[in-house]
């Protein structure tokens, strides 16, 4: 008799999830010598232990603590780049500006980026059919709780000037409901962080507006100022040129505004 299985609204666990996490861990430790001490099998066991046999709507940050402990990593606290709705450009930037780090440049972020996972209550099975959707099913699902946990810790670790890349093509350039707006902004530590500097990335070729005057940016400035952190904002009018100039700063065309 087939067992009844909960049908969730979201996509199921990414195929080859265990193999992908393990392989990403091995690769990360190979290319980051400072993390060579990490035992990737133990990392996978801790990751699995966070959600296997647990109801996928009842996951807590506590479930991820063994994984957090194994993935403890020191990144320079003054070289942190946050992002919202513009992940690809943020990752291209840190590939070029190698002394800066997004969350996905850390071990735990690198393991989980773009993956989906969940289990089932009281069975050791991974659910490849469906997983809970944050809106339609529940917010305390394995993926959402993971990102909330690692994002909070990442923001808490930041110091001095923290940069955030924001997508100027969105109707809400700053969205209070994004991970940046709902988690990271509120976990920056005012006693450590002096300034949050927003980089607003323009999408259109001929878009010369000052998007730092956008109402949602003013809302971000207000939230940040109330937390006793200074706020500054820059328009990045030409993201392609911006990346090229980060790569080749001595290029003669890189003295003008980008």
């Amino acid at each position: 008799v087939p067992r009844w299985r909960q049908q969730w609204s979201g996509p199921g666990t990414t195929k080859r999830f265990p193999e992908t996490v393990l392989a990403r861990c091995v690769k990360y430790t190979e290319i980051h010598p400072e993390m060579r001490h990490v035992d990737c099998q133990s990392v996978w066991d801790a990751f699995k232990g966070a959600f296997i046999s647990k109801h996928p709507c009842n996951i807590t940050e506590e479930d991820y603590q063994p994984l957090m402990k194994l993935g403890t990593q020191t990144v320079p606290c003054n070289k942190i780049l946050l992002w919202s709705r513009i992940k690809d450009l943020a990752h291209q930037f840190t590939q070029v500006q190698r002394d800066m780090f997004t969350l996905e440049d850390t071990l735990l972020g690198y393991l989980a980026d773009d993956l989906t996972w969940c289990g089932e209550f009281n069975t050791s099975k991974i659910n490849y059919q469906s997983c809970p959707d944050w809106r339609k099913d529940c917010s305390n699902n394995p993926v959402s709780v993971f990102w909330k946990t690692v994002s909070r810790r990442f923001a808490e670790a930041a110091c001095d000037v923290v940069h955030v890349m924001l997508n100027g093509s969105r109707s809400k350039i700053f969205d209070k409901n994004s991970t940046f707006g709902s988690v990271e902004v509120h976990n920056l530590q005012p006693e450590k962080v002096q300034t949050l500097e927003a980089w607003v990335i323009h999408g259109g070729r001929e878009d010369s507006r000052d998007l730092c005057q956008d109402p949602t940016i003013k809302e971000l400035e207000s939230i940040i100022s109330k937390r006793n952190i200074q706020f500054s904002c820059k328009n990045i009018y030409r993201p392609d040129k911006f990346l090229q100039c980060v790569k080749n700063p001595e290029d003669s065309s890189c003295t003008s505004e980008i």
């Epitope: 992908t20 393990l22 690769k27 590939q95």
Partner: nanobody, 117 residues
Framework: QVQLQESGGGLVQPGGSLRLSCVGS????????MGWYRQAPGKQRELVGY???????NYADSVKGRFTISSDNAKNTVYLQMNNLKPEDTAVYYC???????????WGQGTQVTVSS
Amino acid sequence: QVQLQESGGGLVQPGGSLRLSCVGSERIFSRNTMGWYRQAPGKQRELVGYVGSMGITNYADSVKGRFTISSDNAKNTVYLQMNNLKPEDTAVYYCNYWHYAAGRDYWGQGTQVTVSS
């Protein structure tokens, strides 16, 4: 399935140079990397260096300053220029394509580099 084909190995004297080439069936994009590993007799395979989609290279400490990786994205090709070769560089050199999203390593068949007088 990414196919990789290496060439350029051989016998060289200490202090000499060699250039390895690797042609891949897929370009480097997103967070994928293409590069080189080596395996000396009786030792584990170790990373030599790699290049990412933005053209930025990384090297193992043991080869920094002597080896240079470059890429030609139009040809899906990665090169390893090895200068000032030492006997301890003797190994089978493997081309590697790392597919981040899938969590998969793809490997060439390997090319022998021997540094000996």
